[in-house]
């Protein structure tokens, strides 16, 4: 009996430019002889339905149809037919199929590969054209993929123990696509500093599929107006 097992859940997520290993494990009732077996990896793009050969291994012959693609013959002996792709790009997302032949048996498995790019976040103060005591804070998130992103603003006053989500005077612009396929977006918070308590901490919170924990940038309103003491948490997907 020949069986192939891929990543549990059927989806693998990897960061852009990472050296990704797409898992494929072979289960066979007898010890594997790599000279009499074959491995072929196929890829089907998200945008069109045509399947393309990425890598093949037959006996002493192996060929990479995607530069740098490799299946380790040494690991193959112990049933690991995982495909390593260095410097993965956004356009390489899609369905990967691992096909194993141990004559006369054949088995296959598929996995969806999602390529994500983590946003970088920065906080800017824009006072151009603003009235006295009125400030505009801009939270710029750039270089992220996929497009879906959630930007919220929170504040924590001196007295109250937990943050409060701010919904008024927040405008989040449209996402803009970059040349490399990643996206940028800016969210703006308008504040009337004369109406706010000194010591109140404001925070721009960015949530994205690529992040384990939200990306936070904050500033504190001081008695002498405001201090942009930006702290960024960049605990990205790994």
């Amino acid at each position: 009996d020949l069986k192939v097992e891929m990543m549990a859940g059927g989806t693998q997520i990897t960061p852009l430019n990472d050296n990704v290993t797409i898992f494929c494990n072979i289960f066979y009732s007898q010890p594997l002889n790599i000279t009499s077996m074959g491995i072929t990896w196929f890829w089907k793009s998200l945008t069109f339905d045509k399947e393309v050969k990425v890598f093949e291994f037959f006996g002493d012959h192996q060929e990479a149809f995607r530069p740098g693609a490799i299946v380790s013959p040494w690991r193959l002996k112990s049933g690991d037919a995982s495909l390593r792709l260095p410097g993965i790009q956004l356009e390489e997302a899609g369905e990967y199929r691992c096909e194993v032949v141990v004559t006369p048996l054949k088995a296959q498995g598929t996995v969806q590969l999602e390529v994500v790019a983590s946003p970088a976040s920065r906080l800017l103060l824009d006072q151009v054209g603003m009235k006295e005591n009125e400030d505009k804070y801009m939270c710029e998130s750039s270089g992220f993929y996929p497009e879906a992103i959630n930007i919220t603003w929170e504040k924590q006053t001196q007295k109250f123990p937990h943050p409060i989500e701010i919904s008024e005077d927040v405008i989040t612009g449209p996402t803009i696509k970059n040349m490399d396929g990643t996206f940028n977006v800016t969210s703006c918070l308008k504040l009337n500093s004369s109406q706010e308590d000194p010591g109140t901490v404001y925070q721009c919170v960015v949530r994205h599929a690529s992040l384990h924990t939200p990306l936070r940038s904050n500033f504190t309103l001081t008695a002498a107006r405001h201090s942009l003491s930006e702290t960024e948490k960049t605990d990205n997907f790994s």
Epitope: E154, Q158, K159, F160, P161, H162, P163, I164, Q203
Partner: antibody, heavy 117, light 107 residues
Framework: QVQLQQPGSVLVRPGASVRLSCKAS????????MNWMKQRPGQGLEWIGG????????DYNEKFKGKATLTVDTSSSTTYMDLSSLTYEDSAVYYC??????????WGQGTTLTVSS | DIVMTQSQKFMSTSVGDRVSVTCKAS??????VAWYQQKPGQSPKALIY???NRYDGVPDRFTGSGSGTDFTLTITNVQSEDLTEYFC?????????FGAGTKLELK
């Protein structure tokens, strides 16, 4: 990292008074507000009151007015809570809690007050 | 004062199960609700703020929901370390008030 140090336990007689302390470190002490909480076994948590750590403002739960008095010593970064005319009902764990420099609240380990004759 | 009611003092669950702890406010508190976990002999630890936002470092099996007067803390795939007590807290106004707590125990 914010740390709030409280004595582990205190034993007092009924009718007496007691001063509980809470020493803060790891953040800009005078900038913040310190709350005090009471927890009796099986009775949930109660907010007693709070004090602005520069000492210029306090706020109390009506239920604890006359029972608790909050003060602060900025030189030692310590907040105090005085409890007067102690009864058995005052036996509880008392926590100090603050916001600190970062989002979220921080709690001391709590002081177990036992009122017993 | 705003009264926070946790109607179930105890709830039975098993490791791997999904469990929902509920809390009801006596008046509209918007989303100004936090959830705390308290293990025996320890001080409470905040898990959720603004009704549904997880604090950093809190496992994603903890989910908060609700607004207005009805709030829920859901734990999916309950772990043995989750079998402890949970409190809700409103922070829309002083005095801050808490629910009486719900203790999760093994079925």
């Amino acid at each position: 990292q914010v740390q709030l140090q409280q004595p582990g336990s205190v034993l007092v007689r009924p009718g007496a008074s007691v001063r509980l302390s809470c020493k803060a470190s790891g953040y800009t002490f005078t900038n913040y507000w310190m709350n005090w909480m009471k927890q009796r076994p099986g009775q949930g948590l109660e907010w007693i009151g709070g004090i602005y750590l520069n000492g210029d403002s306090t706020d109390y739960n009506e239920k604890f007015k006359g029972k608790a008095t909050l003060t602060v010593d900025t030189s030692s970064s310590t907040t105090y809570m005085d409890l007067s005319s102690l009864t058995y009902e005052d036996s509880a764990v008392y926590y100090c809690t603050t916001r600190g420099d970062y989002f979220g609240d921080f709690w001391g380990q709590g002081t177990t007050l036992t009122v017993s004759s | 004062d705003i009264v926070m009611t946790q109607s179930q003092k105890f709830m039975s669950t098993s490791v791997g199960d999904r469990v929902s702890v509920t809390c009801k406010a006596s008046q509209n508190v918007g989303k100004y609700v936090a959830w705390y976990q308290q293990k025996p002999g320890q001080s409470p630890k905040a898990l959720i703020y603004s009704a549904s936002n997880r604090y950093d470092g809190v496992p994603d099996r903890f989910t908060g929901s609700g607004s207005g007067t009805d709030f829920t803390l859901t734990i999916t795939n309950v772990q043995s370390e989750d079998l402890t007590e949970y409190f809700c807290q409103q922070y829309i106004s002083y005095p801050l008030t808490f629910g009486a707590g719900t203790k999760l125990e093994l079925k």
